[in-house]
């Protein structure tokens, strides 16, 4: 087959006329959209056949595929065919119209598909979007075919800009039929039971009408069969449920319970398993470590958390200094115990805007008729340090003293430092640390007292300066685990008149 012009892609002007010729050794025909448009067929003296397709007054709607094929006179078609793609850029045509079936794309598996939005002009930039979103999707575009890729079960539109107007395509809908033809779920009323209690399991199949259930369970292996009950859940169409009920469980009933479901229409099957534990008696077990000393910062909120496992559900109580705690109406204390899984619990004590009086001995107790556990810790309230007083005095002995007093919890550390060059220190030069035993020019005396009522330490430190010959900036810094505070005082020599 010989096609002129050969293509394989042509860009033609709107309103123009164009002639396509195809020739071959047998009768040939032009096809457009599975139909044969009017064309002139001829047979030359040398025995070659030709067909001439004249496209007149071209519009954007003439954009698309054109095929030339052998059209055997005996009605047989050979495989050989030539494809030509013609673009007719036409600003009056946005996206080429689609057949209804092209707008709906149906899939049963994850496979590459094409969203066939096509334009008349190969120079146009086309983007793909989810119908509900503005962000362009990173999918490759072929101007002759559309966007090809693996698409989610959504609706999509294509966008392009022609001149200064934005044009949207029709919406394309991707429908994916989930053919995991059987969807089985197994659950138990409880996965942990005490001996003598009942085991009840449910196996549910969604979306199938004709299914067969088969249960495997520890008791079956010893030949003790249990007859399951199958029912339809009326409020949920085509949810079929098989219930396996074992009354008065024994320790030997612990193990794996499997529900196997088969359906005959497509010969599919699926199975799900669940583990059941039968315990001799109930239990309560702490999980993780909680230190015997806990800290909270004054006026901040603090949550103390205990994680434990229990069956059956326990009662949980909190105590402070052996007095039972409850949620306070003022909202200063909040207690909560929540079930985070079937047998796992988290109990929390929240102290809101902690006060000094809330320091003390706390205990959490979890118990039921079979077992109990308790956990205790001391709560220390940390108070940021503050310098309460920094004063300078001049005893008759001639030395000068600076006294610094502060409080905090835990016990504050004290650091004395001085700046001798007031112009450059501390911005350019670091302050000098004072009170080191090697320095004879200053002596340090520090006393620490614990105030039981306020539950904090008081530090009083006195710095003795032997001879001060020029103004000196003395700084007292108190530090503890939750903060630091600083004050400074200018110490001047005895001799200076403005002292």
């Amino acid at each position: 087959l010989v096609v002129t012009p050969p293509g394989p892609e042509l860009v033609l002007n709107v309103s123009s006329t164009f002639v396509l010729t195809c020739s071959g050794s047998a009768p040939v025909v032009w096809e457009r959209m599975s139909q044969e448009p009017p064309q002139e067929m001829a047979k030359a003296q040398d025995g070659t056949f030709s067909s001439v397709l004249t496209l007149t007054n071209l519009t954007g709607l003439d954009t698309g595929e054109y095929f030339c094929t052998h059209n055997d006179s005996r009605g047989l078609e050979t495989d050989e065919r030539k494809r030509l793609y013609i673009f007719v850029p036409d600003p009056t045509v946005g996206f080429l119209p689609n057949d209804a079936e092209e707008l709906f794309i149906f899939l049963t598996e994850i496979t590459e598909i094409t969203i066939p939005c096509r334009v008349t002009d190969p120079q146009l930039v086309v983007t793909l979007h989810e119908k509900k979103g503005d962000v362009a999707l990173p999918v490759p575009y072929d101007h002759q075919r559309g966007f090809s890729g693996i698409f989610e079960d959504r609706s999509y539109i294509c966008k392009t800009t022609i001149g200064d107007r934005e044009v949207d395509s029709d919406a394309y809908y991707v429908y994916r039929l989930q053919v995991s033809s059987i969807n089985v779920s197994v659950n138990a009323v409880q996965t942990v039971v005490r001996q003598g209690e009942n085991i009840t399991l449910m196996c549910i199949v969604i979306g199938n009408e004709v299914v067969n259930f088969e249960w495997t369970y520890p008791r079956k292996e010893s030949g003790r069969l249990v007859e399951p009950v199958t029912d339809f859940l009326l409020d949920m169409p085509y949810h079929i449920r098989s219930i396996l009920h074992i009354p008065s469980a024994e320790l030997e009933d612990s193990g794996t319970y499997t529900c196997n479901v088969t359906e005959s229409v497509n010969d599919h099957q699926d199975e799900k398993a669940i583990n059941i534990t039968v315990v001799e008696s109930g239990y309560v077990r702490l999980l993780g470590e909680v230190g015997t000393l806990q800290f909270a910062e004054l006026h901040r909120s603090r949550t103390l958390q205990v994680v434990f496992e229990a069956y059956p559900p326990p009662t949980v109580l909190w105590f402070k200094d052996n007095r039972t705690l409850g949620d306070s109406s003022a909202g200063e204390i909040a207690l909560s115990t929540r079930n985070v899984s079937e047998t796992r619990y988290v109990s929390e004590l929240t102290l809101v805007r902690v006060k000094v009086a809330e320091a003390g001995h706390y205990t959490m107790r979890a118990f039921h008729e079979d077992a109990e556990v308790q956990l205790s810790f001391q709560l220390q309230i940390n108070v940021p340090v503050r310098v309460l007083e920094l004063s300078e005095s001049h005893p008759d002995s001639g030395e000068q003293t600076v006294r610094c007093r502060g409080r905090g919890m835990p016990q504050p550390n004290i650091i004395w430092s001085a700046c001798r060059d007031l112009k450059r220190c501390p911005r350019e030069l670091p302050p000098t640390l004072l009170g080191n035993s090697s320095e004879e020019e200053s002596q340090l005396e520090t006393n620490v007292t614990y105030w039981e009522e306020e539950q904090e330490f008081e530090v009083v430190s006195t710095l003795r300066l032997q001879h001060v010959d020029r103004p000196l900036s003395v700084r007292c810094t108190l530090r503890n685990a939750v903060g630091q505070d600083t004050q400074e005082v200018i110490v001047v020599p005895h001799s200076l008149p403005f002292k």
Epitope: K131, K132, E152, D153, R154, S155, Y173, V174, Y175, L177
Partner: nanobody, 116 residues
Framework: QMQLVQSGAEVKNPGASVKVSCKAS????????IQWVRQAPGQGLEWMGW????????HSAQKFQGRVTMTRDTSISTAYMELSGLTSDDTAVYYC?????????WGQGTLVTVSS
């Protein structure tokens, strides 16, 4: 939750007709087109046509034109698909489906068996 529930399995003789129902719930029935699709044993999905539940307009694939009739009863939010002139090639699972924009929703399928 959008949900489509179809009528039960059918066994038909060649030449007979079958009518499959599809009841919608969990959304305004008239808001979204209902598509009818079938899957013959071992084959892919084949689109049959759509129904606009709002207007009652339908459009069927060329292959089924003249044989398929799609109707609806808005008072009970149910769409119907009737296929006439059944042959053994029409043995398939027939599905109704709709698209909420963010995902598609399917009926559970109705098995239609054509045999003499």
């Amino acid at each position: 939750q959008m949900q489509l529930v179809q009528s039960g399995a059918e066994v038909k003789n060649p030449g007979a007709s079958v009518k499959v129902s599809c009841k919608a719930s969990g959304y305004p029935f008239s808001a979204y087109y209902i598509q009818w699709v079938r899957q013959a044993p071992g084959q892919g999905l084949e689109w049959m046509g759509w129904l606009n539940p709002n207007s009652g307009d339908t459009h069927s694939a060329q292959k089924f034109q003249g044989r398929v009739t799609m109707t609806r009863d808005t008072s009970i939010s149910t769409a119907y698909m009737e296929l006439s002139g059944l042959t053994s090639d029409d043995t398939a699972v027939y599905y109704c489906a709709t698209h909420g924009g963010d995902r598609s929703y399917w009926g559970q399928g109705t098995l239609v068996t054509v045999s003499s």
